[in-house]
């Protein structure tokens, strides 16, 4: 990896023992300066593999609300608005980091956690299994 | 929101002043017990709106490596393998939380940051602009 010289102004609280505990400022900086006009706003409805968004709430997690996509159909929507079963609607999944309160119910002590979320759906050609 | 009784065993380091600083254990707990076999592994190639994955690396960020999807085509791939320009390949974007080293180059001091990432692509019907 890349070695970065340590800033002499860093808080002096490093612990060599794992689990490693660090200080995190929860005042979120929003870097979403993405100017791409193609934002995901209504794609869930206009997609050939449309999806519904389900609210997943957990007060012990930060962020407490995560939206999960569930594909509406097994197949994909064709030009006539019908479901084509020779194609598959599948969820696009991503691993994201969240903060889990640890010990539970503590307002200022967390553990990093990786969770898998479905962000949306895409239409794929199925894998055909040939029988010998 | 939901009020949670505070655990008496919590570390006593709460600061009422924003920016709020918390302790985070970086020993990641992986909750990916998802048994769904439809993982996003090869969807980027099999999708009717295929995408390429570009590595975005930043040693000042945790995680330092994030993969960004870029749709391969303006339109979507049809059954003949040609591009259908009457459909659009669009990126599915998601806001995720990352940790940004703050002050820079500090190994144990971070600030939460929201960034927008493109996770994959989906095929959508275009918005038709009707001329009066």
């Amino acid at each position: 990896g890349i070695t970065i010289p340590r800033n002499p102004g860093c808080p002096n609280s490093e612990d060599k023992n794992f689990p490693r505990t660090v200080m995190v400022n929860l005042n979120i900086h929003n870097r979403n300066t993405n100017t791409n006009p193609k934002r995901s706003s209504d794609y869930y409805n206009r997609s050939t593999s449309p999806w519904n968004l389900h609210r997943n709430e957990d007060p012990e997690r930060y962020p407490s609300v995560i939206w999960e996509a569930k594909c509406r159909h097994l197949g994909c929507i064709n030009a006539d608005g019908n479901v084509d079963y020779h194609m598959n609607s599948v969820p696009i999944q991503q691993e994201i980091l969240v903060l889990r309160r640890e010990p539970p119910h503590c307002p200022n002590s967390f553990r990093l956690e990786k969770i898998l979320v479905s962000v949306g759906c895409t239409c794929v050609t199925p894998i055909v299994h040939h029988v010998a | 929101g939901i009020t949670i009784p505070r655990n008496p065993g919590c570390p006593n380091s709460e600061d009422k002043n924003f920016p709020r600083t918390v302790m985070v254990n970086l020993n990641i707990h992986n909750r990916n017990t998802n048994t769904n076999p439809k993982r996003s592994s090869d969807y980027y190639n099999r999708s009717t709106s295929p995408w390429n994955l570009h590595r975005n690396e930043d040693p000042e960020r945790y995680p330092s490596v994030i993969w960004e999807a870029k749709c391969r085509h303006l339109g979507c791939i049809n059954a003949d393998g040609n591009v259908d320009y009457h459909m659009n390949s669009v990126p599915i974007q998601q806001e995720i939380l990352v940790l940004r080293r703050e002050p820079p180059h500090c190994p144990n001091s971070f600030r939460l940051e929201k960034i927008l990432v493109s996770v994959g692509c989906t095929c959508v019907t275009p918005i038709v602009h009707h001329v009066a």
């Epitope: - | 390429n52 870029k70 391969r72 339109g75 591009v83 259908d84 320009y85 009457h86």
Partner: antibody, heavy 110, light 107 residues
Framework: EVQLVESGGGLVQPGGSLRLSCAAS????????ISWVRQAPGKGLEWVGS????????YYADSVKGRFTISADTSKNTAYLQMNSLRAEDTAVYYC???GQRYAMDVWGQ | DIQMTQSPSSLSASVGDRVTITCRAS??????LAWYQQKPGKAPKLLIY???SRASGVPSRFSGSGSGTDFTLTISSLQPEDFATYYC?????????FGQGTKVEIK
């Protein structure tokens, strides 16, 4: 002003090579395909190929597949058409054009 | 590939005439059809996109119609600067294909 400027044409022997350039200005280069269209003397328009600048995908007419290569340098806002193994029937005026899904080929080189 | 057939291949007309050029696609292309005008020694110029929408700066005497497989370009009152060759193009799917062109000449 939105414009495309081609360069690099010339006289070449059969079997030879030539590279054409298409410099774009005045628009977001990555939101479109850049298409190459040719016109043989006294004939109609023929699509040669395209490049989707954002995704990097390239497309070719069967008549040039394997001989012509389209590429782009997004830092220079320039697309290229590399023509190898040239034949007499490739003799034509070559145009580059901006292609979008809504307006088709709305901007052409000179 | 989608074939585009234009007719007529050439026509003679006078200033002030109403001129109609037709274009037929080998399969349905919805409204993904464009019309271009080309004058000798010049690059083509977009006239109509989406079968019926006029491109910026195109005079109102030019109009397009049709959907599916049959399309028409109409010049309501031919002007001296309209003598040129006109091409239709489908952009429904790749490969992009053009009609063979219609040359409008002075009678």
């Amino acid at each position: 002003e939105v414009q495309l400027v081609e360069s690099g044409g010339g006289l070449v022997q059969p079997g030879g090579s030539l590279r054409l350039s298409c410099a774009a200005s005045g628009f977001s280069f990555t939101s479109y395909e850049i298409s190459w269209v040719r016109q043989a003397p006294g004939k109609g328009l023929e699509w040669v190929g395209s490049i989707y600048l954002w995704g990097g995908s390239t497309y070719y007419a069967d008549s040039v597949k394997g001989r012509f290569t389209i590429s782009a340098d997004t830092s220079k806002n320039t697309a290229y058409l590399q023509m190898n193994s040239l034949r007499a029937e490739d003799t034509a005026v070559y145009y580059c054009a901006r292609f979008g899904q809504r307006y088709a080929m709305d901007v052409w080189g000179q | 590939d989608i074939q585009m057939t234009q007719s007529p291949s050439s026509l003679s007309a006078s200033v002030g005439d109403r001129v109609t050029i037709t274009c037929r696609a080998s399969q349905s292309i919805s409204s993904y059809l464009a019309w271009y005008q080309q004058k000798p020694g010049k690059a083509p110029k977009l006239l109509i996109y989406g079968a019926s929408s006029r491109a910026s700066g195109v005079p109102s005497r030019f109009s397009g119609s049709g959907s599916g497989t049959d399309f028409t370009l109409t010049i309501s009152s031919l002007q001296p600067e309209d003598f040129a060759t006109y091409y239709c193009q489908q952009y429904y799917s790749s490969p992009l294909t053009f009609g063979q062109g219609t040359k409008v000449e002075i009678k």
